[in-house]
Interface confidence: low
């Protein structure tokens, strides 16, 4: 196992005196129900907790809310519910946080059943004021920012109407009816579907996709036949019904809608779904559902058009629309993700990809643990992480795998090191290389976090007993020390600590209960005398991204360019700081096929890096779909995978001529398309 | 101390053969990338070809290629330049230089040099 | 490949005097510069790396700066042991590695 406090680790030095001088304890004066927490704005240190209590009285729900607000980051709460008159907020709502540093807090007010519509408590000035206002609907959904103005919201109101406020929820506009969904685009635009006929559901395949640009003073249909739609980077998708069955297909769009292209990706039916599993500007990771009740699909990366897909991943576990998925986003390193597949056996087993979909392999057995039961063969088997599906699934897993992308190459999880995933108690991981090595960090289930851009580590064991135990290192995890921050332990119910990992500030959650009483309570820990100095240039050592092959000049190209980094030695106890950034230097690497995805009409056989015609396309002309019209494509195969940057090197071309014949296939051609003014 | 060491530098005809080396010391020599550089008489630096730390990469200038062949002996601590077909153009100081950071880190500044030694091709 | 341009070719100045030298590369090379001095008769020595930082044993009256295509070498205070000539060299990781044509520092 990880080494723990022994002569290998170096303790931190008069720690105990160091944190019990910035521990600060708020009890809460509530009955305990829920709690909900939200960070107002970055680096300010401002803090809303929602505390709600409900009674459930013989004809009716009683219910209770206090609002607190820290401006220390959680050291001292103040209760400003008299600022929201003592109004009941609807949790289901939440709290909506205004982007950016806007300073805005809407809150949604729980209203008598007779009343005109609903109410909300604003403040654009980082909850200090609020101002009541009351609505001309009763929302449906939480209001809704502009990314681009914050002054902008929307929100759908319980009879299916799109409201619109351009001047921070003062006053309302209801610029469109039987709306099923809406959505922001960029440059202020909104996107939604609208039912002709009976509801969102009886119309599902039939609706219409509508866009306004200037917040409902005109609108424009951009698609019909629509089943559902969904924004992922640059891209606009839609899933469209096919003309003559119930199959739907999916069409994509780069111009906000003004021009559509079929995506070559297979058509699914009505029990099938796809799933925009993370987009960026250069491309999407797709997945397919398969047909019938199979519990997993395919995985597809797009091109820079969103149009052409190449399989990534088969058999990738995801349960049912809107289910469970273990699909990940490795923030601290670039072109890394971790999924799960389900195996011909049934068993679940964890991929990893560095190259943004391009190959999943396993992830590699931690040099300190042994493989588990369910390995054949107890020499060789693999780590496997608990995500979504397995906390879905009532495993013993507290989190689901943590990142950071100013923590560097760190990542963190629950996993078991087997040939699949095991449902005993696991244990925690650490990679400090952006998963290509994992460690045994922690012996079993822990909530963790990452402060200081990854120059600190916090865990808490995850226990059924009250906790009054916390777990930190400075090391990425190498050695612990444990500190006592309470004498009387609480329920644990969370760690909390500012989005961003830069602060130093964490607050752990939970409740006391006595034998007539349980009341919310937070102990916030400060480690910044732990960290006594900044850090400076000899704290930082040079590494180089997915080095696998120290020898190569290539070695760490990852879509077609390599980057070095300086990070924090795990040696040196000091602080990043708030302001701390990533330094990295990027280099341009010289192209290889491994640089480019089969274009269309091409695949690549299994273990080979040549694309080769597909034998059902060979001696055909290739022509796609492509804005509404027939093109040709003369290609020798490749495709520059988005967003690489590669120079030189392999060069294989590529030419497109315009067939100027319309598709068929294409529902969403431009002549379908109107516009209309209100 | 990290010294490196040429040899083998002289006079030759148009058209011949010379081999130079390169003896290292002070460093795990089998750690990391090397290199040769030349300089023409009263000219600037050229880089001539690299080789990774256990010969599976090399890379050659496009003045040289097909001409000269790098080569290392780890066992030896030795470095090698065979240089054929030599052109008058070829005349220079040749220095040996490591990179300076070990295997993992492929960003090319030199450091340090050895003392150089003058291969002078002239009929 | 990628061409370095170093300015001035020569340059005549006085102990204590601030010189300036200049480095182009005819496309972006990101931070990878470094910049070595050379004596009469003595090999190259590895100044600067990365753009801006200074190899250890270096005097720190020895700086870098720049980014993407344009670099620069300064000496914020000449002395006599400086008079020498400056190479600026790409460091991408990639062959061919090129440097520029050199600048000589000379006694004014």
């Known amino acids: 196992s990880a080494p723990g406090e022994d002569e290998e680790c170096g303790r931190v030095r008069d720690f105990v005196a160091k944190l019990a001088n910035n521990t600060h304890q708020h009890v809460f004066d509530d009955l305990r129900g829920s709690v909900s927490l939200s960070w107002v704005g970055d680096s300010t240190g401002v803090i809303l907790v929602l505390t709600t209590f409900h009674v459930p009285l013989v004809i009716m729900t009683f219910g209770q809310s206090k609002l607190y607000r820290s401006e220390d980051y959680g050291k001292n709460f103040k209760d400003i519910t008299d600022l929201i008159n003592n109004t009941f907020i609807r949790t289901e709502f939440g709290m909506a946080i205004g982007p950016e540093n806007s300073g805005k807090v809407v809150l949604t007010a729980e209203v008598s059943g007779g009343s005109r519509g609903g109410r909300i408590f604003r403040s654009s000035d980082f909850a200090k004021n609020f101002v009541q206002t009351d609505l001309p609907f009763h929302p449906l959904t939480q209001m809704m920012y502009s990314p681009q103005n914050s002054d902008y919201l929307l929100a759908l109101s319980t009879e299916n109407g799109l409201w619109v406020s351009k001047n921070f929820g003062g006053k309302w506009e209801e610029i469109h009816k039987a709306v099923c969904l809406a959505k922001w685009g960029s440059d202020n635009t909104i996107f939604f579907t609208t039912y002709a006929n009976g509801s969102c559901k009886a119309d599902l395949g039939a609706l219409e996709l509508w866009r306004t640009s200037d917040l409902g003073k005109s609108f424009k249909t951009i698609g019909v036949k629509i089943y559902s739609f969904g924004l992922g980077g640059r891209f606009l998708f839609a899933s469209v019904m096919a003309d003559k069955d119930t199959t739907r297909r999916i069409h994509v769009s780069t111009d906000q809608g003004d021009t559509w292209s079929m995506a070559q990706l297979p058509s699914v039916g009505q029990e099938q779904f796809y799933s925009i599993l993370a987009a960026n500007d250069d491309m999407v990771f797709m997945h397919v559902d398969e047909p019938g009740d199979t519990g997993f699909g395919t995985i597809f990366t797009s091109d820079d058009r969103g149009i052409v897909y190449s399989k990534s991943l088969d058999r990738h576990l995801y349960t049912t629309t809107g289910g469970e998925t273990d699909f990940t986003n490795v923030t601290s390193l670039r072109g890394v993700y971790i999924t799960s597949v389900l195996s011909e056996d049934n068993s679940i087993q964890t991929m990893i990809t560095f190259d943004q979909g391009g190959r999943w392999t396993h992830l590699r057995k931690p040099e300190n643990s042994e493989c588990d039961a369910t390995a054949k063969n107890k020499n060789e088997c693999s780590l496997h992480i608990h995500a979504s599906y397995s906390i879905s699934q009532k495993l013993n897993v507290p989190m689901a795998p943590l990142s950071e992308p100013n923590a560097v190459g760190i990542v963190i999880a629950h996993g078991s090191v087997g040939d699949a995933i095991s449902v005993m108690v696991p244990d925690v991981y650490i990679s400090d290389d952006g998963g290509y090595s994992w460690t045994k960090m922690l012996e079993g289930p822990h909530y963790y976090t990452i402060l200081d851009s990854g120059g600190i580590i916090v865990a808490i064991e995850h226990s059924s007993r009250p906790i009054n135990v916390i777990k930190f290192s400075t090391d990425e995890g190498q050695c612990w020390q444990t500190y006592t921050f309470t004498r009387d332990p609480i329920y644990f119910t969370g760690l909390a600590s500012e989005p961003g990992a830069r602060s130093m500030n964490i607050s752990i959650w939970g409740f006391t209960e006595s034998f007539l009483t349980s009341q919310w309570v937070s102990y916030t820990i400060d480690f910044k005398d732990i960290l006594e100095r900044n850090c400076e240039e000899k704290d930082y050592t040079i590494w180089l991204a997915h080095s696998t092959d120290p020898e190569d000049y290539e070695d760490g190209c990852i879509l077609g360019y390599k980057e070095q980094f300086l990070r924090l030695r795990k040696s040196s106890v000091c602080q990043n700081g708030r302001d701390y950034v990533v330094t990295k230097q990027p280099s341009i690497c010289l192209c290889s096929l491994e640089d480019f995805l089969c274009d269309f009409g091409y695949y690549r056989p299994e273990n080979d890096s040549k694309c080769v015609e597909q034998p059902e396309l060979k001696g055909h002309d290739l022509e796609f779909c492509l804005y509404g019209r027939e093109e040709h494509l003369t290609t020798n195969g490749y495709r520059k995978i988005p967003g690489d940057k590669c120079q030189g090197g392999v060069n294989p071309v590529r030419e497109v001529k315009d067939l100027k014949k319309k598709c068929t296939s294409n529902f969403l051609s431009p002549e379908k398309q109107n516009s209309k003014s209100n | 101390e990290v010294q490196l060491v040429e040899s083998g530098g002289g006079l030759v005809k148009p058209g011949g053969s010379l081999r130079l080396s390169c003896a290292a010391s002070g460093f795990t020599f089998s750690s990391y990338s090397m290199n040769w550089v030349r300089q023409a008489p009263g000219k600037g630096l050229e880089w001539v070809s690299s080789?990774?730390?256990?010969?599976?990469?090399?890379y050659y200038a496009d003045s040289v290629k097909g001409r000269f062949t790098i080569s290392r002996d780890n066992a030896k601590n030795s470095l090698y330049l065979q240089m054929n077909s030599l052109r008058a153009e070829d005349t220079a100081v040749y220095y040996c230089a490591r990179d300076r950071l070990g295997r993992g880190y492929k960003w090319n500044w030199f450091d340090p040099w050895g003392q150089g030694t003058l291969v002078t091709v002239s009929s | 490949d990628i061409q370095m341009t170093q300015s001035p070719s020569s340059v005549s100045a006085s102990v204590g005097d601030r010189v300036t030298i200049t480095c182009r590369a005819s496309q972006g090379i990101d931070s990878w510069l470094a910049w070595y001095q050379q004596k009469p008769g003595k090999a190259p020595k590895l100044l600067i790396y990365a753009a801006s930082s200074l190899q250890s044993g270096v005097p720190s009256r020895f700086s870098g700066s720049g980014s993407g295509t344009d670099f620069t070498l300064t000496i914020s205070s000449l002395q006599p042991e400086d008079f020498a000539t400056y190479y600026c060299?790409?460091?991408?990781?990639?062959?061919?590695?090129?440097f520029g044509g050199g600048t000589k520092v000379e006694i004014k």
């Open positions: 080789i990774s730390s256990s010969s599976s990469y090399i």
């Open positions: 060299q790409q460091g991408n990781s990639l062959p061919p590695i090129t």
